[in-house]
Every structure is written in structure tokens, then in C-alpha cells.
Interface confidence: low
């Protein structure tokens, strides 16, 4: 049928609550395109009637709520004037009783459901709520081990739970809850989050803060030259090393023979309270083998990565 396929990672979801998935794949969906959702290769599109439990809402597919039998492969077809593109989403629905300790944890948790707090720091957790504009979300409540979180160390700010002076006892199972209103009906959204605590640097030293990168992907064409800065703030008297690594090896060592990827010379700017350090990584020529590898910037105990991503082809032409 001439559509080009892109396969997306599985989504693992909880039954009996709302779920939405947005069919977006820039730059394809940034132009004038029509988006149609289908289930399990059916020729009949998902309904656009807002009263339907499962319906398409603009580019989204919306489940109000998700049910056990909704598991399966959903396909989103993006049609442009001269193009057709298809995204596959494999939804697995499971029964999760958040407060039943006899039930096992979430299988294959995505990063949204695994979060880290930094010991001794002021930090935050994020409640990931992805829904179309037609869904109105009420205030978020936070729970730990099934008890609503209260206390002066905790502040709810929009979709975040601010935690001051993080302690080891803050690790555990959290949940964020919101009431979603759609077409006059109300639904409860409850997301579980497994929280772990990372230690601060020893000897009472402060943890360097990596301003950039932020654990994200960068779209870059094959064969191009790419330079990425790692920007780090640290105390003026720090003794931390800053470097780029790949596969747990210094990039200069890993690419010792080809010298195709190199670490740059570190520079820093001195401020009154701290220093801002910059050390870059240069890809002289991006190769296929570079895609999907986390290139890690290390600064003392802090790390952040970039992952190179192949840009979507220019689909306007065919």
C-alpha cells in the first residue's frame, strides 16, 4: 500500500484508567497531514465520536478508560499530499493494584515510571500525564506506599512533587493521581513511580550539575560533523574530572585508531560562587554505528547522555 513503516516501542499500561497516545513523528506530522488510527490491521478506522470509549481525538487515540481487552497493535497512518507513513504501537494492558503488595511490580518500566532523587538535595518527581486538549486534568495528589504525602518537605507544583532535603527514607513506591474530565465525565488517572535515591559525593563535597546534555536524543544526518558541548557547573574548589565516555570507555581511547570521535579541550568561566565548565565531543563524521549509543558526559558522580538519532527521511518527495 506504499506506506512506510516505523515501529514504536511497546507501551505497558494499567487497566481501568484513561490512556492516550499522540501520533506524532516530526517532521512528518509538522506539515499538512491527515492522521487516522486503526486497530490490529483493521480497515475500519477508530471512531472519531467523542462519546465512544475508544476514539480518535485529532492526532491522539484516547481510551476512556483502558480495558483488559484493549491490548494489541494499533496503527496510526499519517498521510501527506505525496506521502504515507505508518506508526505501530503495541499496547499491553495489565491489572495493577497499586496498594496490593502481593502483586509484582510493573514489567519493563519506562523511565517515566522510574525516577531518582538525589540524597541531601532539593529535588522533584514528575507526574507524566499525556492527554489531548479535550481532557481537563484536575489537581494532582501524591501518594507514597498508598498514603497521601503530607509534610513541610513536600510541595506539589503543577505536575511535580518538590522534595526538599531528600533522605534515604524517600525511596520507595510513589503514585500520582489526577481526576481527568472529558465530555462531562470524570476518570481517575493513577501513575505508579518507583523512586530510588542516588548518593551525593563523599567527603561532604557538592555534586556537579550537568546543565547540558539532558539525557536526550539529537537528530543528525549520516556523514555530518557534529559538536556537542557538555556544560557543567561545579564549586570553585572542586577536584572533579569532566570527560566524555562511550561503552564506559573514554572516547579518545575508544576511537584511538580512527580518531573519528574526539573529546575537546576543557574550558571554564569563573563566576562568584561557581565555575561553568565546557568540554565538547566532536564527531568528525557521523556513522551508522553511532546511532543508538549513549555518549555519556561525566562530571564527578554526575552523568548525562546524548543519543544520536537518524532523522526521519524527507517524505514530501515521494
Amino acid at each position: 500500500d506504499g506506506c512506510k513503516d516505523i515501529f514504536m516501542k511497546n507501551e505497558i499500561l494499567s487497566a481501568s484508567q484513561p490512556f492516550a497516545f499522540n501520533c506524532t513523528f516530526p517532521p512528518i506530522t509538522s506539515g499538512e497531514v491527515s492522521v487516522t488510527w486503526y486497530k490490529n490491521s483493521s480497515k475500519i478506522p477508530v471512531s472519531k465520536i467523542i462519546q465512544s470509549r475508544i476514539h480518535q481525538d485529532e492526532t491522539w487515540i484516547l481510551f476512556l478508560p483502558m480495558e483488559w481487552g484493549d491490548s494489541g497493535v494499533y496503527q496510526c497512518v499519517i498521510k501527506g499530499r505525496d506521502s504515507c507513513h505508518r506508526i505501530h504501537v503495541n499496547l499491553t494492558v495489565f491489572e495493577k493494584h497499586w496498594c496490593d503488595t502481593s502483586i509484582g511490580g510493573l514489567p519493563n518500566l519506562s523511565d517515566e515510571y522510574k525516577q531518582i532523587l538525589h540524597l541531601g538535595k532539593d529535588d522533584s518527581l514528575t507526574c507524566h500525564l499525556h492527554f489531548p486538549k479535550s481532557c481537563v486534568l484536575g489537581p494532582i495528589k501524591w501518594y507514597k506506599d498508598c498514603n497521601e504525602i503530607k509534610g513541610e518537605r513536600f510541595t506539589v507544583l503543577e505536575t511535580r512533587l518538590l522534595v526538599s532535603n531528600v533522605s534515604a527514607e524517600d525511596r520507595g513506591n510513589y503514585a500520582c493521581q489526577a481526576i481527568l474530565t472529558h465530555s462531562g465525565k470524570q476518570y481517575e488517572v493513577l501513575n505508579g513511580i518507583t523512586v530510588s535515591i542516588t548518593e551525593r559525593a563523599g567527603y561532604g563535597g557538592s555534586v556537579p550539575k550537568i546543565i547540558y546534555p539532558k539525557n536526550h536524543s539529537i537528530e543528525v544526518q549520516l556523514g555530518t560533523t557534529l559538536i556537542v558541548d557538555c556544560n557543567v557547573t561545579d564549586t570553585k574548589d572542586n577536584t572533579n574530572l569532566r570527560c566524555w565516555r562511550v561503552n564506559n570507555t573514554l572516547v579518545d581511547d575508544y576511537y584511538d585508531e580512527s580518531k573519528r570521535i574526539r573529546e575537546g579541550v576543557e574550558t571554564h568561566v569563573s563566576f562568584r560562587e561557581h565555575n561553568l565548565y565546557t568540554v565538547n565531543i566532536t564527531f568528525l563524521e557521523v556513522k551508522m554505528e553511532d546511532y543508538g549509543l549513549p555518549f555519556m558526559c561525566h562530571a564527578g558522580v554526575s552523568t548525562a547522555y546524548i543519543i544520536l538519532q537518524l532523522p526521519a527521511p524527507d517524505f514530501r518527495a515521494y
Epitope: 516505523i6 505508518r86 536526550h216 543508538g292 537518524l310
Partner: antibody
């Protein structure tokens, strides 16, 4: 060792049917789209049909659409090509091939880019003649 | 369907020569182009994928370049085992299509 082994070729009369099989081993079969490619005697390569890893999506060249059906049995690691209403011009060596895959993780998803056919079978000859 | 036009259809060259084969798509295919080598009686072998990436195990004398509609396969120094037929193929959209092939013969 990654291997593809075709079978089922032979001599068939015009209008007849034939079913080709391709047994895959040495790799995760469900992760790869698969294709059939043919080559008429003394001619170039022609892509015939393709199927996604799950088997949910199938694709055909115009020359075989409506006559050939591609399918796969992932429990048996086997790819099939059911050929009906065969014509003399379908005479060719038929190769089964694996579509190479590049996995590109993004923030919350992985994009799977299918590229060239990186593993090929030895081919099976189909002759359509009266 | 996207048409792939290869040129030349055949060429004669000597061992050590630099050989260039071109492939043109009837419309833009971004970088979704692959190159194959085929020897008589054998299955094709993937050489280059996504326009410029060398398939594992392929000698570095083979290289690919191009994007959009115009692509090139270069053999920097032709070796005796390189005498074969070479095909380009687009995997930009189905139906995938091959070029007509370029036969590289001994001069």
C-alpha cells in the same frame, strides 16, 4: 549461524500454483521484516513481496498483486510465498531475504529503520512452462 | 513506483582501477539506497546500506555516497574478486525497486 533456506520450487504449468517456503535460523525471526526477491534467467533482480515482523503488514510488487500471497509462521521461523495463476514470466530463481534493521532509541520510543536485505537464501528455481 | 536507473549497464576495467557506478532515482529517496554485489549462480550480497554505510565484513575499498536522487558506488582499487554485477535498490517506499544492474568485466 544466520541462515535462510528456500524450498518448494519446481516445474509448474501456466495457471498452476506453487508454495515456496523459507526456513530461517540463527536470528530472532520476529524482529525482522522479510522479503521475496526473484531473478528471471539472465535478468536483473526484482523485489516481489515483503512482510513485517509480526506478519500484520504485507507488501507486493504490482506484477504479482492479487496472485501471490506472502505469509509467515513465527512459531516455526518460516516464511511462505503462495503463488497462484502462474505465468511464463514468473519463471525465475526466487530468493528469500531478511530486511536489515537499525534500532534508533529516542526519548520514549525506539524507531526501527528497515534497510537493505542483509541475509539471503540460496534461491529456489520456479519454472512455469507447458 | 520509483524507478531506479543504473549506469553504465556494463564496464570493462583492470585490476587496480578505480570504478564508479551511478544510480539515479526517479524521485527523492533521501538516503534509503542500498548496493548489492552478485556473482553468477550466487545470491546477492549487501555491500552498502543507507547510501554510505559499509555492511559488516565488506572490504573498505567499497564506498557509497549520495542522497536525494543521485547515488554513487565506488570501488577504489578493483580486485579480481570484484568482477561481478552490481545492483542498487531503494527501500524508501514499497514496492522496493532495483536498478537494472552494472556488470563489471575484466578488460
Amino acid at each position: 549461524e544466520v541462515q535462510l533456506l528456500e524450498s518448494g520450487g519446481g516445474l509448474v504449468q501456466p495457471g498452476g500454483s506453487l508454495r515456496l517456503s523459507c526456513a530461517a535460523s540463527g536470528f530472532t525471526f520476529t524482529s525482522h521484516a522479510m522479503s521475496w526477491v526473484r531473478q528471471a534467467p539472465g535478468k536483473g533482480l526484482e523485489w516481489v513481496s515483503g512482510i513485517s515482523g509480526s506478519g500484520a503488514n504485507t507488501y507486493y510488487a504490482d506484477s504479482v498483486k492479487g496472485r501471490f500471497t506472502i505469509s509467515r509462521d513465527n512459531s516455526k521461523n518460516t516464511l511462505y510465498l503462495q503463488m497462484n495463476s502462474l505465468r511464463a514470466e514468473d519463471t525465475a530463481v526466487y530468493y528469500c531475504a531478511r530486511d536489515g534493521i537499525v534500532v534508533v532509541p529516542a526519548a520514549n520510543h525506539s524507531y526501527y529503520y528497515y534497510y537493505g536485505m542483509d541475509v539471503w537464501g540460496q534461491g529456489t528455481l520456479v519454472t512455469v512452462s507447458s | 513506483d520509483i524507478q531506479m536507473t543504473q549506469s553504465p549497464s556494463s564496464l570493462s576495467a583492470s585490476v587496480g582501477d578505480r570504478v564508479t557506478i551511478t544510480c539515479r532515482a526517479s524521485q527523492s529517496i533521501s538516503v534509503h539506497l542500498n548496493w548489492y554485489q552478485q556473482k553468477p549462480g550466487k545470491a546477492p550480497k549487501l555491500l552498502i546500506y543507507i547510501a554510505s554505510n559499509l555492511q559488516s565484513g565488506v572490504p573498505s575499498r567499497f564506498s557509497g555516497s549520495g542522497s536525494g536522487t543521485d547515488f554513487t558506488l565506488t570501488i577504489s582499487s578493483l580486485q579480481p574478486e570484484d568482477f561481478a554485477t552490481y545492483y542498487c535498490q531503494q527501500t524508501y517506499t514499497t514496492p522496493y525497486t532495483f536498478g537494472g544492474g552494472t556488470k563489471v568485466e575484466i578488460k
